[in-house]
């Protein structure tokens, strides 16, 4: 059961209920486990995991990435700015997670779990965020055309895109987890 769902809490009534921060932490770790499982399939299926970073860098995907200005690094840490960046970044990743849905054979359920757990994580974080006005939601039309474009790529590019999305999402979540533990 994904940590975003409550059946674990019901099954263990004597355990202290998780705090908001603990829930978020657990949710991120659950998603990272899912990403790792998906990457096992992609690495077994293609040689993308051996691709050099140079080859990856040539891919023109505009995936969310933490930068100094986002306030998530300890030097220049800013809780509100960082939280906005994490939520905005996760919202931007949603279209890429949608793209992943038809990319797996044996791990189809795992891909769905990563997508749904990310939606739950966004909800947790939105409850935590005070300045929701600063969070920009991606334009659905732009997302739809991006999805169409990604799905029209040749097989090699689709494999590369899948690998790059999973790697970038992992790094974004790791950065987010480090930052959230400072909050």
């Amino acid at each position: 059961v994904p940590p975003g769902e409550d059946s674990k809490d019901v099954a263990a009534p004597h355990r202290q209920p998780l705090t908001s921060s603990e829930r978020i932490d657990k949710q991120i770790r659950y998603i990272l486990d899912g990403i790792s499982a998906l990457r096992k399939e992609t690495c077994n299926k293609s040689n993308m995991c051996e691709s050099s970073k140079e080859a990856l860098a040539e891919n023109n995907l505009n995936l969310p990435k933490m930068a100094e200005k986002d306030g998530c690094f300890q030097s220049g840490f800013n809780e509100e700015t960082c939280l906005v960046k994490i939520i905005t970044g996760l919202l931007e990743f949603e279209v890429y997670l949608e793209y992943l849905q038809n990319r797996f054979e044996s791990s189809e359920e795992q891909a769905r779990a990563v997508q749904m757990s990310t939606k739950v994580l966004i909800q947790f974080l939105q409850k935590k965020a005070k300045n929701l006005d600063a969070i920009t939601t991606p334009d659905p039309t732009t997302n739809a055309s991006l999805l169409t474009k990604l799905q029209a790529q040749n097989q090699w590019l689709q494999d590369m895109t899948t690998h790059l999305i999973l790697r970038s999402f992992k790094e974004f979540l790791q950065s987010s987890l480090r930052a959230l533990r400072q909050m």
Epitope: I28, R29, L32, S36, R39, C43, C49, E50, K53, M66, F73, Q74, S75, F77, R167, K170, E171, Q174, S175, L177, R178, R181, Q182
Partner: antibody
Amino acid sequence: EVQLQESGPGLVKPSQTLSLTCTVSGGSIATSYYAWSWIRQPPGKGLEWMGVIDYDGDTYYKPSLKSRTSISRDTSKNQFSLQLSSVTPEDTAVYYCARAGLGDSYYLGTYYAMDYWGKGTLVTVSS
Amino acid sequence: QSALTQPPSMSGTLGKTLTISCNGTSSDIGSGDYVSWYQQLPGTTPKLLIEGVTTRASGIPDRFSASKSDNTASLTISGLQSEDEATYYCASYRETNNVVFGGGTHLTVLS
């Protein structure tokens, strides 16, 4: 008990590529959330972290060495390798491989704690 | 030039307590609980003493303890013994995705 063993040539000529392999026994490099690092120590000097390959096969390198360094793994042989190109005499050092990734390191990407080390192998760069 | 700064050498008296400091920045030591300490006896491989700022590695005696304040980490050895004579290194995760070591502190134990 996890054991690591470095192997490779002890002498490399300047401008060539240094290649080392670390063979891991007592545990698979593919079945846990650990990462695998390379660290070097020039004679009489301190330790220098060079890079790491994590559980997913992602690599991270010391910024100043990034352009010359490559770490890869072969899970079927339970080995990981280091390649350092365009070497100079300043690259002469004892090269260690080590296991990293205690606690929550995988989830955080913070491979700062290395609990098992190889014995080290001295590589001399000289013509 | 090491990324983390340690005193190159220190001496302590048998049975006494000694503290080694390790100075960094907000990008490394200050960035979280990501500090480790190593002991390297002469001619041997480094050995993990401490991880996660304060947690002793398996089999490490409680004479070794560590702490952190802001951008400085410290290793304290109490009840100094002759076998503690070694070089001690601190290490830290550094944003983004790399690791840095201190230059090492050579400890001499005086009787």
